[in-house]
């Protein structure tokens, strides 16, 4: 990790932009911990493998999380 810092958070900026679940490669939810005192959500996009930090408080991102978990529950037996 390139940034030298005492707190080991990942996100420098956060995005409120809606993300199409179909364009997602991966969605990581990192819970708050002793290393970083806030929840961080990192979306890896299919296009060029771009990683984007999402705002956990954003309505659009909350809807995305719901959509993704719904999709996962459909897939699991």
């Amino acid at each position: 990790v390139p940034l030298s810092r005492t707190v080991r958070c990942t996100c420098i900026s956060i995005s409120n932009q809606p993300v199409n679940p179909r364009s997602l490669e991966k969605l990581e939810i990192i819970p708050a911990s002793q290393f970083c005192p806030r929840v961080e959500i990192i979306a890896t996009m299919k296009k060029k493998g771009e990683k984007r930090c999402l705002n956990p408080e954003s309505k659009a991102i909350k809807n995305l999380l719901k959509a993704v978990s719904k999709e996962r529950s459909k897939r699991s037996p």
């Epitope: 940034l3 996100c11 990192i42």
Partner: antibody, heavy 124, light 109 residues
Framework: QVQLVESGGGVVQPGRSLRLSCTAS????????MHWVRQAPGKGLEWVAV????????GYADSVKGRFTISRDNSKNTLYLQMNSLRAEDTAVYYC?????????????????WGQGTTVTVSS | EIVLTQSPGTLSLSPGERATLSCRAS???????LAWYQQKPGQAPRLLIY???SRATGIPDRFSGSGSGTDFTLTISRLEPEDFAVYYC??????????FGPGTKVDIK
Amino acid sequence: QVQLVESGGGVVQPGRSLRLSCTASGFTFSDYGMHWVRQAPGKGLEWVAVIGYGGLIKGYADSVKGRFTISRDNSKNTLYLQMNSLRAEDTAVYYCAREGAGSSVYYYYGMDVWGQGTTVTVSS
Amino acid sequence: EIVLTQSPGTLSLSPGERATLSCRASQSVSSSYLAWYQQKPGQAPRLLIYGASSRATGIPDRFSGSGSGTDFTLTISRLEPEDFAVYYCQQYGSSPIFTFGPGTKVDIK
């Protein structure tokens, strides 16, 4: 519209202190990392410092480490640069710049909005 | 510490010509961390390219970025009068954390 306005520059003697401010408008300041970048007269760009959207991540160029402190007040939409022990080589135009939305330690979206700069002259 | 070198220092071209600007890193840089900026005299820099090849919002498609590892390129397919400026590459990921190259000046022949 999206705007960054720097202030606080001026002429200061070597060894003295100065605090620069950058006031943001037209966007949700608390969602964005912010930078200070400087440019000495007739020279190229030099990155100075970064602060994450919530103030938890901070980083400094070696040339200012221990002398400059970056901070922010999200309630006032304002970014600061406290500059102590100033030297002649700190003379430059100081720009504040916004880190692109969604940037992380894994992917860099660049500095997508810049102020017009404030001039700092360190001279006896 | 990664050092960026840009070449040529100055590029003299005519409007309508193709400009190819080079940025070389002293060590391998992830393309996720490479950006290009344009700066005109008396103005603040403007972001052109991030992630080595993605155009920033509002940037015309005559600007394109490419490259990986230690060699990156900014290409302006057909120079417009407003493109004559200084261009900087920038990398994120070493100490100092964000490093700019020395710049390439594109001026009118």
